[in-house]
């Protein structure tokens, strides 16, 4: 699998589009799970809903959303509030039984928020009637990661 | 209605070489995954590998890998099993199964069969 | 590999019986559990899937039971048509594997 890189901006949403086949892996939930170490385990961060058919309700683990298109074929992970220990390589997986298969292998990187050295006057807060989701702007670039590129530093 | 329709009996020598296949019909053949499964003579079944007909993706039993060889041709809903090198002990019925996924716990089943290919290889 | 171990590996009963055949799987296998029929010279058959969902076109009298490691397969009443081999077979993991098979023999 080549590793698709997404880049957010700190403090603001990120979304995260994983496209799949979606005959291959009719009835079959998915996962969001974040590697840890080059060769380490997958740790789960969030799966869609248990039902299967229920798979396009979003669901929630603390800033982590998924929800999954299975007619369409495209499985949505949302970073809310993306800070730098976000940064890391994840998987998108397809669940049957107890296994996974990994739909596509993320690299995710948090860019420092521009907004950060200006005075606290140029910064823009929503009302109190505005929710502070609606304030967000979801912010995605990606690429794949060059041949050569290694998503972990190297161990000595 | 389904089925699966497997190439008939083959008597092989040993060192030879042979390809069985499975049709499918009567549904969307790229759209499930089609398995195969051993049953030596008077004995239980095992499962060898799958192939997802259509992008052709295989997992192969750790027991068959390297052993055998699983495809398929879309265009004409076939699946194929098939050895290089034949063996007294690949004496069996072989048999192909389509893999049903099961939206209630997302795992899947074999609920159609083909009939077998019974393979006996013999000097 | 999951390991899958039925009991017993045979038993005779009679036309209108009702008989529980056991699987054990070598680890938890939550409840990706199949069941399947096998008559002499035939392809075997779905009866349960997902340890106690009844396969479309099978009868009634047939149902499963069981999640982890334990489960069951029963046949409330036995009809003549019942008399075959049965396998239980794991759908958790690759490779997915099978029980020995448990014989139903007419006593």
């Known amino acids: 699998h080549n590793t698709t890189v997404f880049q957010g901006v700190a403090g603001q949403s990120l979304q995260v589009s994983c496209p799949y086949d979606s005959m291959k892996h009719w009835g079959r939930r998915k996962a969001w799970c974040r590697q840890l170490g080059e060769k380490g385990p997958c740790q789960r961060v969030v799966s869609t809903h248990n039902l299967w058919l229920l798979s396009f309700l979003r669901r929630w683990n603390g800033s982590t959303a998924i929800t999954d298109d299975t007619l369409g074929g495209t499985l949505t992970i949302t970073l809310r509030n993306l800070q730098p220990h976000d940064a890391g390589l994840y998987q998108c997986q397809s669940l049957h039984g107890s296994e996974a298969d990994t739909l596509r292998k993320v690299l995710v990187e948090v860019l420092a928020d521009p907004l950060d050295h200006r005075d606290a006057g140029d910064l823009w807060f929503p009302g109190e009637s505005e929710s502070f989701e609606d304030a967000h702007v979801e912010h995605s670039i990606s690429r794949s990661l060059l041949e050569g590129e290694i998503p972990f530093p190297p161990t000595s | 209605e389904v089925q699966l329709v497997q190439s008939g009996a083959e008597v092989k020598k040993p060192g030879e070489s042979l390809k069985i296949s499975c049709k499918g019909s009567?549904?969307?053949?790229?759209?499930?995954?089609i398995a195969w499964v051993r049953q030596m003579p008077g004995k239980g079944l095992e499962w060898m590998g799958t192939?997802?007909?259509?992008?052709?993706?295989?997992r192969y039993s750790p027991s068959f890998q390297g052993q055998v060889t699983i495809s398929a041709d879309k265009s004409i809903s076939t699946a194929y099993l098939q050895w290089s090198s034949l063996k007294a002990s690949d004496t069996a019925m072989y048999f192909c199964?389509?893999?049903?996924?099961?939206?209630?716990?997302?795992?899947?089943?074999?609920?159609?069969w083909g009939q077998g290919t019974l393979v006996t290889v013999s000097s | 590999d999951i390991q899958m171990t039925q009991s017993p590996s045979s038993v005779s009963a009679s036309v209108g019986d009702r008989v529980t055949i056991t699987c054990r799987a070598s680890?938890?296998?939550?409840?990706?559990l199949a069941w399947y029929q096998q008559k002499p010279g035939k392809a075997p058959k779905l009866l349960i899937y997902a340890a106690s969902s009844l396969q479309n076109g099978v009868p009634s009298r047939f149902s499963g039971s069981g999640s982890g490691t334990d489960f069951t397969l029963t046949i409330s009443s036995l009809q003549p048509e019942d008399f075959a081999t049965y396998f239980c077979?794991?759908?958790?993991?690759?490779?997915?594997?099978f029980g020995q098979g448990t014989k139903l023999e007419i006593k």
């Open positions: 680890q938890g296998i939550s409840s990706w």
């Open positions: 199964a389509r893999q049903r996924t099961f939206y209630y716990d997302s795992s899947d089943y074999f609920d159609y």
């Open positions: 192939i997802y007909p259509g992008d052709s993706d295989t």
């Open positions: 009567g549904y969307s053949f790229t759209s499930y995954w």
């Open positions: 077979q794991q759908a958790d993991s690759h490779p997915r594997t």
